[in-house]
């Protein structure tokens, strides 16, 4: 069967700051088996936005529920945006292990984050 | 294209602080890593240290106390700041950019500087 | 750190002969997502480095086409299919897997 891969199909997403951000992340296979995480950046240097498996992560939500076994959307809400959230951000499978580990990463979608309206 | 040009005087006393800048033109300095790397009189390259855009640091270990990498958005520059130099640290320095888009690691230092070359000396 | 060894540390070459330079790291570059974190640069005479290969195997943009990596864990391999003039300088591989960031050695190509 073929290889799981990440899509994100929005290359780039443009919010005015004080509203939410919707970043779009599906997969195409349910193999492997292992969470998703999403972070802004990559490199050595990436920060962690969103860990479906464990941690706090206030502004986010998951858009669909992303705990069900059959899930495949990955998409989450980013809320009250601010200039300092623009930047690319890469939805990334990880393999089930001990520890997870990093299995394939999405293209990216960079977030802009305008004025807010007056 | 992105342009790079490293600045900065090119003759440093012994135990003084070397000083040196790289203004980026034609691009964002956003979503890269921007890089320092020296090349010794007749020797291989050595990664002194790159700041990633959100403004963390990574340094070569062998260097760490001694250098610090900072970064200005507004100006589009990044600089290098080092420490206590002596006839070691003379060389050519250059500023470079590393990109980053598939994982942890990263993906070539795609552009760099001309290379400004720093004699340290009494 | 991981340590990176090129050879050969000199390597002369005829025009329009293939050349090949050898790269191994103490440690392995390839990471869980499949990519071997490994590049390899060009110093021509005088000028700076250019990439030339990156994430092991794939070229840099404008590179041409002789040029080629291949190899991955710890051992990696540049080859020239038919090396040219402009081809004459010192290549360096460098593992960007991990920081420090370090480069192999270098190896000198020159014309026979």
């Known amino acids: 069967e073929e290889e799981l891969q990440v899509i994100q199909p929005d290359k780039s997403v443009s919010v005015a700051a004080g509203e939410s951000a919707i970043l779009h992340c599906t997969v195409t296979s349910l193999i492997p088996v292992g969470p998703i995480q999403w972070f802004r950046g990559a490199g050595p240097a990436r920060e962690l936005i969103y860990n479906q498996k464990e941690g706090h992560f206030p502004r986010v939500t998951t858009v669909s529920e992303s705990t069900k076994r059959e899930n495949m959307d990955f998409s989450i809400s980013i809320s009250n945006i601010t200039p300092a959230d623009a930047g690319t951000y890469y939805c990334v499978k990880f393999r089930k292990g001990s520890p997870d580990t990093e299995f394939k990463s999405g293209a990216g979608t960079e977030l802009s984050v305008r004025a807010k309206p007056s | 294209q992105v342009q790079l040009q490293e600045s900065g005087p090119g003759l440093v006393r012994p135990s003084e602080t070397l000083s040196l800048t790289c203004t980026v033109s034609?691009?964002?300095?956003?979503?890269?890593?921007w890089s320092w790397i020296r090349q010794p009189p007749g020797k291989g390259l050595e990664w002194i240290g790159f700041?990633?855009?959100?403004?963390?640091?990574f340094y070569n270990s062998s260097l760490k106390s001694r250098v610090t990498i900072s970064l200005d958005m507004s100006m589009n520059q990044f600089s290098l700041k080092m420490t206590s130099v002596t006839a070691a640290d003379t060389a050519v320095y250059y500023c470079?950019?590393?990109?980053?888009?598939?994982?942890?690691?990263?993906?070539?230092?795609?552009?760099w500087g001309q290379g400004t070359t720093v004699t340290v000396s009494s | 750190d991981i340590v990176m060894t090129q050879s050969p540390l000199s390597l002369p070459v005829t025009p329009g002969e293939p050349a090949s330079i050898s790269c191994k790291s103490s440690?392995?570059?390839?990471?869980?997502?499949?990519?071997?974190?490994l590049d390899w640069y060009l110093q021509r005479p005088g000028q700076s480095p250019q990439l030339l290969i990156y994430?092991?195997?794939n070229r840099a943009s404008g590179v041409p086409d002789r040029f080629s990596g291949s190899g991955s864990g710890t051992d990696f391999t540049l080859k020239i299919s038919r090396v040219e003039a402009e081809d004459v300088g010192v290549f360096y591989c460098?593992?960007?897997?991990?920081?420090?960031?370090?480069f192999g050695g270098g190896t000198k190509v020159e014309i026979k």
């Open positions: 470079a950019r590393v990109r980053a888009y598939s994982g942890i690691g990263l993906d070539g230092t795609d552009v």
């Open positions: 034609g691009g964002s300095i956003r979503n890269y890593y």
């Open positions: 700041i990633y855009y959100n403004g963390r640091t």
């Open positions: 440690q392995s570059l390839l990471y869980s997502n499949g990519y071997n974190y």
């Open positions: 994430l092991g195997s």
């Open positions: 460098m593992q960007a897997l991990q920081t420090p960031l370090t």
